[in-house]
């Protein structure tokens, strides 16, 4: 079981008066509705809070919001709803917050129903003033800003028309009509499906892809029989109707849709979906659902063109389109997912990846740990981590399983251990090597989170009472304190820091509930005086990521290379700081046939590393052709793992063969295109 | 088998310096970090600083800080230990041991295969 | 650094004896010590590991316990091989021996 607080946990001294000379309460003169809050810039300290309250009336709905703002990571909050002159903000569209440290934030009104458009407000000095700006039409989505510059804006209209402001909202400008889906792509292009003839609906299937590099000056259709599209990465991807039948298939494009490849994947009918799991620059991972209502699919990971896939899990839990899965990136270490499958007998088990999609495994028994009613066998099972699934079933689980870049390795998540998912309530597991060990952290489910770049996690027990106790740990969940931050115990509804782990405050909100009046408060922690002093070298030790065997030559190898990290030792009490860089250092491997995949007509077949040529091409499910400038495919049968950084070792060269003939398409090829003009 | 074989024993002037080699045979050198600890006659064991070979990242104790380098040749998997400033306090017997490792941590596992130590004599 | 307190210094007792050495962190040290053995003229030898783990090939009689500053080796029936000086050492800081404790025949 978890280490509690006994005589073998190096406590921190004096921490109860440290902990209450840092712990600010703020009361909100606000009715309890609905709470959300927002950070404006990082490291900025800056918060803004939206406080909603909803009475419905017999005719219409009532409504009152409150704007808050916070310079000091929500030590103190001063009340600006008079800034956005006492406006109903639209909770649907939450705070657009903008890019980066640049200030900017939207919010959007409610307006009465006649009105000719809708009302935002804009703020570019981190929510100190806000400009009132009029629209000339009703949005249906939030304001979305470019990636590349702040001032640029578009937003959809309830009539389907596409808007572009090019000075942060003070102008608008209606680009096109008749627009389903709009995206921000890189070097400020958008990319938007269009119909022609009745809705976005009726015309699923036939939509078209378009494109616009100068904010609506000029267009290009890029794209014809368009279902849907999607970025990720480098890549651009569309799902493409089929000439003969009601199926369709991903095609990719890394040219911004100047041309255009067919994905080498099944194809889906009209029951099915494609989802984009997750996509970097150098590759990306695709489920394909299965036919029927199964409730799963499978996961491809693709090659560094977006082309040529190989399969990497069977059965994946994928609830219907827009539904739930588990897939989630370890951000804490690199090439680690964790996600779930569904098996034959209908249970739900972990499995998790450490080289991208390579090879998937159960995660390992935490030590110490019993097996649960799940397990066939009482000596052998395996951890099974709880996520967006379990969530939507409303079991017992608060939150999702948390790693952050900078906190190397660590992983902390609700679970069971068993030979799957159990509905019972869950434990709180953490991991310190990204997901190869795990060890129970805390007993029950908790909400928790990380600060100081993994030097404190925070924990709060998920309960229907009021609460007034909060756990830290400055040892990666070894050893736990409790801190009792109030007298009066709250309502809790949510554990809110900074995103990005570096900060070292944390905000607790909730309600308190008298008998006729129910009130927001929150309180923030700082643990600044708990980590008295900066980190220096000694405090940090050196670790190698993905070890699994040291009596092997390439321990660590993940994908061509092994690195190794500064970590900070579980028994330093310090800071790391606002500024700390995670301190790592690579050494490239040598190449083995691991490391690459086998290229489009080629396959592996089982328990073999080598990739053998298919027979035979045609009639194949998976077949793909390159359409562009290059009209031929040439390929020597094996292709670099996406991101593999091997050197020198096994070199797999084969005869280049030309696969030009064995390929058929239908999609658009760049003579169909054309451009327009606005 | 793993094997650390250290190189000869030294007599050194005060002021001076010394170099050990310690070279490992029979494993994977570069896979583990090697520590220097030294033996006084009649004293304890005090360790002086450690290296991994990959990357050759060294770290020192806080007494030996800047008098001792710590380098490692992975082509012929020897470490090496260089200690300057020789005083008579110095004589002693210096071993180089691996750590042992399970996980990702070098440092954290004990010293799993010892040198047979060198001794290492300043006298004037 | 951390320091480390080893106890007793010398300790007298007979083949057959049940023997226990303790050692102290000035701070916490998680799981993170490792004991060894000594005889004059040899280099030390690794026995225990993270606390409690015997390390391959050293007989079952040594055991390792305790976490966070406190911990203990008992060897559970001295045998005559067993007379020599034994250190602990954590390594969780920078690596710090305890001062050693002998080990001599009554």
């Known amino acids: 079981s978890a280490p509690g607080e006994d005589e073998e946990c190096g406590r921190v001294r004096d921490f109860v008066a440290k902990l209450a000379n840092n712990t600010h309460q703020h009361v909100f003169d606000d009715l309890r509705g609905s709470v959300s809050l927002s950070w404006v810039g990082d490291s900025t300290g800056v918060i803004l809070v939206l406080t909603t309250f909803h009475v419905p009336l017999v005719i219409m709905t009532f409504g009152q919001s409150k704007l808050y703002r916070s310079e000091d990571y929500g030590k103190n909050f001063k009340d600006i709803t008079d800034l956005i002159n006492n406006t109903f903000i639209r909770t649907e569209f939450g705070m657009a917050i903008g890019p980066e440290n640049s200030g900017k934030v939207v919010l959007t009104a409610e307006v009465s129903g006649g009105s000719r458009g809708g009302r935002i407000f804009r703020s570019s000095d981190f929510a100190k003033n806000f400009v009132q700006t009029d629209l000339p039409f009703h949005p249906l989505t939030q304001m979305m800003y470019s990636p590349q510059n702040s001032d640029y804006l578009l937003a959809l209209s309830t009539e389907n028309g596409l808007w572009v402001s090019k000075n942060f909202g003070g102008k608008w400008e209606e680009i096109h009509k008749a627009v389903c889906l709009a995206k921000w792509g890189s070097d400020n292009t958008i990319f938007f499906t269009t119909y022609a003839n009745g809705s976005c609906k009726a015309d699923l299937g036939a939509l078209e892809l378009w494109r616009t590099s100068d904010l609506g000056k000029s267009f290009k259709t890029i794209g014809v029989k368009i279902y849907s599209f999607g970025l990720g990465g480098r890549f651009l991807f569309a799902s493409v109707m089929a000439d003969k039948d009601t199926t369709r298939r991903i095609h990719v494009s890394t040219d911004q849709g100047d041309t255009w490849s067919m994905a080498q994947l099944p194809s889906v009918g009209q029951e099915q979906f494609y989802s984009i799991l997750a996509a970097n620059d150098d590759m990306v991972f695709m489920h394909v659902d299965e036919p029927g209502d199964t409730g799963f699919g499978t996961i491809f990971t693709s090659d560094d063109r977006g082309i040529v896939y190989s399969k990497s899990l069977d059965r994946h839990l994928y609830t219907t389109t827009g539904g739930e899965t588990d897939f989630t990136n370890v951000t804490s270490l690199r090439g680690v997912y964790i996600t779930s499958v569904l098996s034959e007998d209908n249970s739900i088990q972990t499995m998790i990846t450490f080289d991208q999609g390579g090879r998937w495994t159960h995660l390992r028994k935490p030590e110490n740990s019993e097996c649960d009613a799940t397990a066939k066998n009482k000596n052998e099972c395996s951890l099974h981590i709880h996520a967006s699934y379990s969530i939507s079933q409303k079991l017992n689980v608060p939150m999702a399983p948390l790693s952050e870049p900078n906190a190397v390795g660590i992983v902390i998540a609700h679970g069971s251990v068993g030979d799957a998912i159990s509905v019972m309530v869950p434990d709180v597991y953490i991991s310190d090597d990204g997901g190869y060990s795990w060890t129970k952290m805390l007993e029950g489910p908790h909400y928790y989170t990380i600060l100081d770049s993994g030097g404190i996690i925070v924990a709060i027990e998920h309960s229907s009472r009021p609460i007034n106790v909060i756990k830290f740990s400055t040892d990666e969940g070894q050893c736990w304190q409790t801190y009792t931050f109030t007298r009066d115990p709250i309502y809790f509804t949510g554990l809110a820091s900074e995103p990005g782990a570096r900060s070292m405050n944390i905000s607790i909100w909730g309600f308190t509930e008298s008998f006729l009046t129910a009130q927001w408060v929150s309180y923030t922690i700082d643990f600044k005086d708990i980590l008295e002093r900066n980190c220096e070298e000694k405090d940090y030790t050196i670790w190698l990521a993905h070890s699994t065997d040291p009596e092997d030559y390439e321990d660590g190898c993940i994908l061509g290379y092994k690195e190794q990290f500064l970590r900070l030792r579980k028994s330093s009490v310090c800071q790391n700081g606002r500024d700390y860089v995670v301190t790592k250092q690579p050494s490239i491997c040598l190449c083995s046939l691991e490391d690459f995949l086998c290229d489009f007509g080629y396959y592996r077949p089982e328990n073999d590393s080598k990739c053998v040529e298919q027979p035979e091409l045609k009639g194949h499910d998976l077949e793909f052709c390159l359409y562009g400038r290059e009209e031929h495919l040439t390929t020597n049968g094996y292709r670099k793992i996406p991101g593999d950084k091997c050197q020198g070792g096994v070199n797999p060269v084969r005869e280049v063969k030309d696969l030009k003939k064995k390929c058929t398409s239908n999609f658009l090829s760049p003579e169909k295109q054309n451009s327009k003009s606005n | 088998q793993v094997q650390l074989v250290q190189s000869g024993a030294e007599v050194k002037k005060p002021g001076s310096s010394v170099k050990v080699s310690c070279k490992a045979s029979?494993?994977?050198?570069?896979?583990?970090?090697i520590s220097w600890v030294r033996q006084a006659p009649g004293q304890g064991l005090e360790w002086m600083g450690g290296i991994i070979p990959i990357g050759g990242w060294a770290n020192y104790a806080q007494k030996f800080q800047g008098r001792v380098t710590i380098t490692a040749d992975e082509s012929t998997s020897t470490a090496y230990m260089e200690l300057s400033s020789l005083r008579s306090e110095d004589t002693a017997v210096y071993y180089c041991?691996?750590?042992?490792?399970?996980?990702?941590?070098?440092?954290?596992?004990?010293?799993?295969?010892w040198g047979q130590g060198t001794t290492v004599t300043v006298s004037s | 650094d951390i320091q480390m307190t080893q106890s007793p210094s010398t300790l007298s007792a007979s083949v057959g004896d049940r023997v226990t050495i303790t050692c102290r962190a000035s701070q916490s040290i998680s799981s993170w010590l490792a004991w060894y053995q000594q005889k004059p003229g040899k280099a030390p030898k690794l026995l225990i590991y993270k606390a409690s783990s015997l390390e391959s090939g050293v007989p079952s009689r040594f055991s390792g316990s305790g976490s966070g500053t406190e911990f203990t080796l008992t060897i559970s029936s001295l045998q005559p091989d067993d007379f020599a000086t034994y250190y602990c050492?954590?390594?969780?800081?920078?690596?710090?021996f305890g001062g050693g404790t002998k080990v001599e025949i009554k």
């Open positions: 041991a691996r750590q042992g490792r399970k996980t990702g941590y070098y440092y954290y596992y004990g010293m799993d295969v």
């Open positions: 029979g494993g994977t050198f570069r896979n583990y970090a």
């Open positions: 050492q954590q390594a969780d800081g920078h690596i710090t």
